[in-house]
Structures are given as C-alpha cells and as structure tokens.
C-alpha cells in the first residue's frame, strides 16, 4: 500500500489523483472521499457507479482507466481521498491515499508601511506584505530594484534604510501559493520617505 | 547547464493533431512554471500558456484554449504542448521557456521546434 | 487583451550612436514589463525586467525605462553585434502580450 500524498488544486480548476495499475488484474476499484463513497469503477473501466448527484459531472476517469480526475474543484473539496483496488490476484486490497488542499488564486498582495523615522538623513521604515483575505500558504518575496542593488529578501516584512541623496529604489512583494503567483504595486523608496522628509525625528505610519 | 530543448514538430495537415516535447536539464524542473511561445514566420512572439510545477494550474491565451493543452511530466524533466485541430496560421517556431526564479519573463529558452501546417 | 505596440518596425542606426525603442501598452501595466533580443536565426534573449532593471550579464548600454503605459529600451553606444529584433514584453495581467517587435538596423 502507498504512501500518503500531497496534492494542490485551484479552486474552479481540476484534480487528478494518479493511479498506476500494472501486473494486477482488476476488479474493480473504489474511491472515498473522507470515508464517504465517492465512485467505484468496475473492470477495464466498464462501469462507473457516481452515488452523489452533485459530484457526477465532476468526476471523470481519463481514457477508460481508474485514475479519478475531479473537475469544478470547490474549496470544501479538500480532505482525504482513499482508493481501495480490489483484485482476486490479492488477498488483501491495495489502498492510496491522497490528500487534496484546494487553493484559491492569490489576488494582488498589500503592502502597508510601518512606523516611519528619519534620522540623519536616513529613511527607515519596514514594509508588511499580506494578502487581503488570509489566504493559506502564501510564500512572500521581495524584489529590492535600483541601479545600486537587484536583490531578493524572503520573508513577508522588508526591513528599508533609504538615504537621502541615494538613487531611488524599487521594492516589489511577490506572493505565491501553490497554484498561482502575483505580486504587488511597486513601492518607490523616495516616495515613501517624502512625508518624513520635512521633520527629520519624525515617526509616522 | 540550463537547457531546454523542444522537438516533435513537423509537417501537419489542416484539422490535425502533434504533440511537442521541451526537455529541460540541468535546473530543477519540477519547481518551475513553465511557458511555451510561438513565432510565425517573419511575425512577433505569442505567449500560449503556462503550467505549474504540479500541473495543478494551466493558463492559456485564451483564443488557444480550446485547441491546445499544456501538460508536464515532472519524472522525465518533459513539458509537453498537444496541438488539435491546428490551422494554416498555426504555422510557427514553438519555443518552451524557464521564468526567471519563477517569476513572469523568461531568461531560458529552447532552441524551438517548427510547425508547419499545410496540406 | 493588454496590447504592445511597438510603433516602429525598422529602426536604422550607427555604430557609436544612442538609439530608443519604444513600446506602448493599451492600459496601465505598472512596470510589469520585459525587453528581448532575437538576433537572426537565434532565441530571444532577455535583457530588462520589471521595466528597468538589467538581467545578469547585459551590458550597461542597454537600459530601460517607463512605467504605466509608455516604456523605452536606450542602447547607448550601439555595437555591430546590436543588429536583431527588439521585444517588449508586459506581464501585469493575463495573457501575457509581447510588442510585434522592433528591427534594428546598423549603417
């Protein structure tokens, strides 16, 4: 019997849960969704039982195999799937299992600045990148532009030391999950610092 | 070395079907999106489409969605491109591109592989 | 569908001169935007990202700039080896568009 597998879905997408049958006979395979039933396909692909109504036109099995390709994917789709294959050749069924995660295509993240000081010349602040609605296992990249740097900076927070006199930079979040990436407004550095510019002790958000 | 290297094109009649490979080495494909661009002849670069690196998201130009599918195998470092029901304008270098570090230009490109539609 | 518009197809220039390759967006694409050279019988090559920034290995005398629907690649000091065709590409929004493309020419 296989190991658990991890598998990613775009909501509205589709899913295909991979089965490699070889050197078995079968007779028919069944497919369970959180320990519901979800589809049983009888030998050689030649009967497909599909209990649930709302689920029919989401299930296919691809050319005539058991592999069960899951269509119109809905956040609440994610859980786990299990598939039993039931053979005569064995004695007991051989089981996959699969857990699916749905995502939801990533919307252009946000950026929001920190508390602002000025002090010497020196801009510094932190920028914040989130996405807007909380989605899940979103990865934050920053993207620090400018003739002076190109550099790449992991994590949702950018740390900035700007100084006056400086050549502007660019800073771009990137936010990807994993089914999709975007990324943010670019966010100029001289721009950012102009509203400290006129009181140089200056704190603001 | 990062490499990217398409073939299966050729001759193909109107209303036909081919299949092209990119196989990419010395990079770790499976954590990449991947693109396939075309170019008709003498004419500028058009972006098909796009997968993931699971596959568990495809986008498309949209007036190619219906005739061509994007698809990868991340076992044989494969990405593939089905073309159906191809057109004499179908006729182009077909070239599969790396994003750089995954973001949305492409600093990887195949060699391309020709296609051309006649009957 | 965000359109490129590469307004010149032929561009002539010398050895030792600047030229400017312009390309305009149909909307605001930010700086959502790639510059690419095909020299003949060959693959693009990227040159610029995020509309100004060069990509490894680019030599200085290509430089890029714009933002929102107007953008330029300057080569300054253009070289013989300069002689391809010249793609913008913008990446805002799907689908992904390139410029038809700018033909460089040397004297």
């Known amino acids: 019997s296989g190991t658990l597998k991890k598998v990613a879905g775009a909501l509205d997408g589709s899913v295909t849960f991979t089965l490699n049958i070889t050197e078995i006979k079968v007779d028919y395979v069944v497919w369970t969704f959180n320990t519901f039933f979800l589809a049983m396909v009888k030998k050689d692909g030649g009967t497909i039982i599909v209990t649930q109504n709302r689920n029919r036109e989401r299930v296919d099995f691809p050319d005539g195999g058991y592999s069960l390709k899951l269509s119109k994917l809905k956040k609440n789709d994610s859980g786990i799937y299990y598939v039993g294959i039931y053979s005569s050749s064995l004695q007991q069924p051989s089981t996959q299992e699969y857990v699916l995660h749905v995502y939801e295509h990533l919307s252009k993240p946000k950026v929001t600045m920190g508390l602002q000081s000025n002090k010497n010349g020196t801009c510094v602040t932190n920028l914040t990148c989130c996405m807007e609605h909380g989605e899940e296992d979103v990865i934050y990249t920053w993207k620090a532009l400018g003739q002076a740097a190109n550099e790449s900076h992991n994590g949702s927070i950018l740390p900035i030391s700007w100084r006056w006199g400086e050549s502007d930079m660019t800073f771009i979040c990137v936010a990807r999950n994993p089914v999709s990436r975007n990324f943010s407004s670019p966010i100029l550095a001289r721009k950012l610092c102009e509203g400290a510019a006129d009181d140089p002790d200056s704190s603001m958000v | 070395e990062v490499k990217l290297l398409e073939s299966g094109g050729g001759l193909v009649q109107p209303g036909g079907s081919l299949k092209l490979s990119c196989a990419a080495s010395?990079?770790?494909?499976?954590?990449?999106?991947m693109s396939w661009v075309r170019q008709a002849p003498g004419k500028g670069l058009e972006w098909i489409g796009e997968?993931?690196?699971?596959?568990?998201?495809?986008n498309y130009t949209p007036s190619l969605k219906d005739k061509f599918i994007i698809s990868r195998d991340n076992a044989k470092n494969t990405l593939y491109l089905q073309m159906s029901k191809v057109r004499s304008e179908d006729t182009a270098l077909y070239y599969c591109?790396?994003?750089?570090?995954?973001?949305?230009?492409?600093?990887?490109w195949g060699a391309g592989t020709t296609v051309t539609v006649s009957s | 569908d965000i359109v490129m518009t590469q307004s010149h197809k032929f561009m002539s220039t010398s050895v030792g001169d600047r030229v400017s390759i312009t390309c305009k967006a149909s909307?605001?694409?930010?700086?959502?935007v790639a510059w690419y050279q095909q020299k003949p019988g060959q693959s693009p090559k990227l040159l610029i990202y995020?509309?100004?920034t060069r990509h490894t290995g680019v030599p200085d005398r290509f430089t890029g700039s714009g933002s929102g629907t107007d953008f330029t690649l300057t080569i300054s000091n253009v070289q013989s080896e300069d002689l391809a065709d010249y793609f913008c590409?913008?990446?805002?929004?799907?689908?992904?568009?390139f410029g038809g493309g700018t033909k460089l020419e040397i004297k």
């Open positions: 591109a790396r994003p750089d570090g995954n973001y949305w230009y492409f600093d990887v």
């Open positions: 010395g990079f770790d494909f499976s954590r990449y999106w």
């Open positions: 997968i993931n690196p699971d596959s568990s998201t495809i």
């Open positions: 909307q605001d694409v930010g700086i959502a």
């Open positions: 995020w509309a100004s």
């Open positions: 590409q913008q990446y805002s929004s799907y689908p992904y568009t």
